[in-house]
C-alpha cells in the first residue's frame, strides 16, 4: 500500500480569515498614523500635498451599501501596491531630510508588503479570481527640490492612511455579510 | 493644520429657514466624506447626516429626513447644510466634522442655531 | 432615548483608573467599530479612541479603549484633573443606516 494519505484538508473559515486580515490593516493603519504626525513634527505641512501619481480614493460612505469582496480585495490590493511603490521611492529618492524617518519608514514599507501578501493569500483561500499581473508601472521622477521630497511624503503617507481607513471600514463591513 | 470653521447660525422663527457653512481647510477637502452633528442645550450629541467626497451619495438621520440638506462646493472648501421647516427641537450647537473611516478625527467649533417666535 | 447606553456619570481621585462603559447590539457595536470622544467644558469634542482601540495621534495612552461582542468600554489610568469632561461612545448602526452615540457620561476627578 502507498503512503498513508494526508490529513484532510480543512477549508479555511472566510471570516477568521478576514480578521486576520483587519488586524494587519488596523496595525499598519496605526503605524502609518504615527508616521504621519512625526513627519508633521519634524516638517509642518502648509496646506494640502497632492501626488498625481497616486490612487484615486476608492470608497466612502456612499460605496459601502454596495461592497462586494471580490472588488473590495481587488482594489485595495491594487492601491496598495502603488503606495508600496511610492514608500520605496520616497525611500530611494526622498533625499537627505526623509532620512530621519528611518528605520520607521523601512518598517511601514516591510508591513506594507506582508498585508500585500496577507491579501493576495486571502484572496487564493477564498477562491477569488486572481488580478492579472500588474503591467511595469513607468518610474516616479524623484521630487525637484529637498522640499519636492516632503511635499511628496505628506501626500503619500497622508493618501495611505485614508486608505487603510476606509480598508478597515470596508472589510468589517465584509465580514458580517460573509 | 487641519481647520473646520462653521458659520450661519442664529435666531429663526418655527417653520423658518437656515444655511449653515462649513470651512475647510489644511487638508485635501475633496478626498473626506464630510458630516453634520448637533448638540441641544445641555444634551449629548447627535449625527445629523454625511456627504460623500465627491457629493455622490448622502446619509440623514431619520428626524432630519426632508427637511434638512447637505451639499458640498469642492472647489471652494466648503460644506453646508440647509434646514427648511424648523421646529423648537432643532435647537442645538451644529457642527462639522471629517471622516476618514468609521470615526469624526476633526470637529469644527460649533455654530448655535435657535429656533424661537 | 440613545441607542447606545452608557451611565450618566462616573469619578475618581487623581490618580485612580476609571473605566466607562458603552452597551449597544449586534447591528451598531457587535459588527461595526466604536469610537469615543472626549467633549471639554465649552468646547466640541474631539476624538479620543477609533476602531476600538487605536489612539489618534497626540492623545495620551493613559487611555485606552476596548470591545467585546457588543459592549465596549474606555479605561483612563492615571486620572488628572483636566480629564473632567464628557465621553461619548460611538458606531455605525446597519438597521437605522446612521451614526449612532451613547447619552454621554460626565467624568468628575474629585
Known amino acids: 500500500p502507498g503512503p498513508p494519505p494526508g490529513p484532510p484538508r480543512v477549508s479555511p473559515d472566510p471570516r477568521a480569515e478576514l480578521d486576520s486580515t483587519v488586524l494587519l490593516t488596523r496595525s499598519l493603519l496605526a503605524d502609518t498614523r504615527q508616521l504621519a504626525a512625526q513627519l508633521r513634527d519634524k516638517f509642518p505641512a502648509d496646506g494640502d500635498h497632492n501626488l498625481d501619481s497616486l490612487p484615486t480614493l476608492a470608497m466612502s460612505a456612499g460605496a459601502l451599501g454596495a461592497l462586494q469582496l471580490p472588488g473590495v480585495l481587488t482594489r485595495l490590493r491594487a492601491d496598495l501596491l502603488s503606495y508600496l511603490r511610492h514608500v520605496q521611492w520616497l525611500r530611494r529618492a526622498g533625499g537627505s531630510s526623509l532620512k530621519t524617518l528611518e528605520p520607521e519608514l523601512g518598517t511601514l514599507q516591510a508591513r506594507l508588503d506582508r498585508l500585500l501578501r496577507r491579501l493576495q493569500l486571502l484572496m487564493s483561500r477564498l477562491a477569488l479570481p486572481q488580478p492579472p499581473p500588474d503591467p511595469p508601472a513607468p518610474p516616479l521622477a524623484p521630487p525637484s527640490s529637498a522640499w519636492g521630497g516632503i511635499r511628496a511624503a505628506h501626500a503619500i503617507l497622508g493618501g495611505l492612511h485614508l486608505t487603510l481607513d476606509w480598508a478597515v471600514r470596508g472589510l468589517l463591513l465584509l465580514k458580517t455579510r460573509l | 493644520e487641519v481647520q473646520l470653521l462653521e458659520s450661519g447660525g442664529g435666531l429663526v422663527q418655527p417653520g423658518g429657514s437656515l444655511r449653515l457653512s462649513c470651512a475647510a481647510s489644511g487638508f485635501t477637502f475633496s478626498h473626506y466624506d464630510m458630516n453634520w452633528l448637533r448638540q441641544a442645550p445641555g444634551k449629548g450629541l447627535e449625527w445629523v447626516g454625511v456627504i460623500s467626497y465627491d457629493a455622490s451619495n448622502k446619509f440623514y438621520a431619520d428626524f432630519v429626513k426632508g427637511r434638512f440638506t447637505i451639499s458640498r462646493d469642492n472647489s471652494k472648501n466648503t460644506l453646508y447644510l440647509q434646514m427648511n421647516s424648523l421646529r423648537a427641537e432643532d435647537t442645538a450647537v451644529y457642527y462639522c466634522?471629517?471622516?476618514?473611516?468609521?470615526?469624526?478625527?476633526?470637529w469644527g467649533q460649533g455654530t448655535l442655531v435657535t429656533v424661537s417666535s | 432615548q440613545s441607542v447606545l447606553t452608557q451611565p450618566p456619570s462616573a469619578s475618581g481621585t487623581p490618580g485612580q483608573r476609571v473605566t466607562i462603559s458603552c452597551s449597544g447590539s449586534?447591528?451598531?457595536?457587535?459588527?461595526?467599530?466604536v469610537n469615543w470622544y472626549q467633549q471639554l467644558p465649552g468646547t466640541a469634542p474631539k476624538l479620543l479612541i477609533y476602531y476600538d482601540d487605536l489612539l489618534p495621534s497626540g492623545v495620551p495612552d493613559r487611555f485606552s479603549g476596548s470591545k467585546s461582542g457588543t459592549s465596549a468600554s474606555l479605561a483612563i489610568s492615571g486620572l488628572r484633573s483636566e480629564d473632567e469632561a464628557d465621553y461619548y461612545c460611538?458606531?455605525?448602526?446597519?438597521?437605522?443606516?446612521?451614526?449612532?452615540f451613547g447619552g454621554g457620561t460626565k467624568l468628575t476627578v474629585l
Open positions: 460611538s458606531a455605525w448602526d446597519d438597521s437605522l443606516n446612521a451614526v449612532v
Open positions: 449586534s447591528s451598531n457595536i457587535g459588527n461595526n467599530a
Open positions: 466634522a471629517r471622516t476618514p473611516g468609521s470615526h469624526f478625527d476633526y
